[in-house]
Amino acid sequence: MMTGTIETTGNISAEKGGSIILQCHLSSTTAQVTQVNWEQQDQLLAICNADLGWHISPSFKDRVAPGPGLGLTLQSLTVNDTGEYFCIYHTYPDGTYTGRIFLEVLESSVAEHGARFQIPHHHHHH
């Protein structure tokens, strides 16, 4: 049975041209994390493999930085970066846990971080 939950930075906002850290944390499971994938809609942004380290998608290398930890830093934000981001934890033996973050990139300087909150996890087994 999968007991884990993913806590994320939740709904967040940031200024155009600025940067933002996307963070997820997997808790309540002893499963081994083998890989974390960061995705935006239908695009893979980055992979952090437990054995092999970080690998950033070539199309995002100039704007995405690994970390801190298993998180991801998005830089030089544009309004087009607004949308859903997913952290996908591949674990053994549990399977896959998914966390969702919604980022809104604002034109104005009135950008505030949403409160950290816990979301239900979506999952499937390998």
């Epitope: 083998t34 890989q35 994938n37 995705e39 239908d42 695009q43 893979l44 992979i47 493999n49 054995d51 092999l52 380290g53 690998h55 950033i56 998608s57 070539p58 199309s59 591949h90 499937h124």
Partner: antibody
Framework: EVQLVQSGAEVKKPGASVKVSCKAS????????IEWVRQAPGQRLEWMGV????????NYKEKFKGRVTITADKSSSTAYMELSSLRSEDTAVYYC??????????WGQGTTVTVSS | DIVMTQSPDSLAVSLGERATINCKAS??????VAWYQHKPGQSPKLLIY???YRYTGVPDRFSGSGSGTDFTLTISSLQAEDVAVYYC?????????FGGGTKVEIK
């Protein structure tokens, strides 16, 4: 110019081991992964495992765990794949490839390994 | 493991005509799919990565599309030098599995 040059063809008896080398040149060896892929006659390409030469971290396909060892020598920019307890089904062409974000942008020329009694 | 299923197994197309190869992943792989061309006696060559990005030096008659589980490689106008076996590969998670290959020939 990026190049991956592999060692020559090998003929081995069942139960023996084989060690294939892959010498990289033309790029920073520790900045990319080295992946190993094989193709048995009439079969699809099969990923075997990978090494990060910078960290030494490895990841193997489950079916090869305990039988394959991938290593890298930073001083000579050479990666090695050793496969033990060889059987006839291991007869294949073995390729090393440079891994960029887990796809393979440069490949070695291939090393034919024949396992026969 | 993620299973990559290619179709068709083989394809005969007239010179100058379009060739379309499909690849289906057994589970979600986002855009983590690459395509390779493999000619007899040669090493495979990378054509497409991240589903739709053409690799450096690859002719623009080759294009890729798809995301999630369904992917397509298209050769818009088949040339004689395109005769080969084409493989899809998922680079989403280890082990990095390949499709069974599609042999492209000239009709």
């Amino acid at each position: 110019e990026v190049q991956l040059v592999q060692s020559g063809a090998e003929v081995k008896k069942p139960g023996a081991s084989v060690k294939v080398s892959c010498k990289a040149s033309g790029y920073a060896f520790t900045n990319y992964l080295i992946e190993w892929v094989r193709q048995a006659p009439g079969q699809r390409l099969e990923w075997m495992g990978v090494i990060n030469p910078g960290s030494g971290g490895t990841n193997y396909k489950e079916k090869f765990k305990g039988r394959v060892t991938i290593t890298a020598d930073k001083s000579s920019s050479t990666a090695y794949m050793e496969l033990s307890s060889l059987r006839s089904e291991d007869t294949a062409v073995y390729y090393c490839a440079r891994g960029e974000y887990f796809f393979f942008d440069y490949w070695g020329q291939g090393t034919t390994v024949t396992v026969s009694s | 493991d993620i299973v990559m299923t290619q179709s068709p197994d083989s394809l005969a197309v007239s010179l100058g005509e379009r060739a379309t190869i499909n690849c289906k992943a057994s589970q979600h792989v986002s855009d983590g799919v690459a395509w390779y061309q493999h000619k007899p006696g040669q090493s495979p060559k990378l054509l497409i990565y991240s589903a739709s990005y053409r690799y450096t030096g690859v002719p623009d008659r080759f294009s890729g599309s798809g995301s999630g589980t369904d992917f397509t490689l298209t050769i818009s106008s088949l040339q004689a030098e395109d005769v080969a076996v084409y493989y899809c590969q998922q680079h989403y998670n280890t082990p990095h599995t390949f499709g069974g290959g599609t042999k492209v020939e000239i009709k």
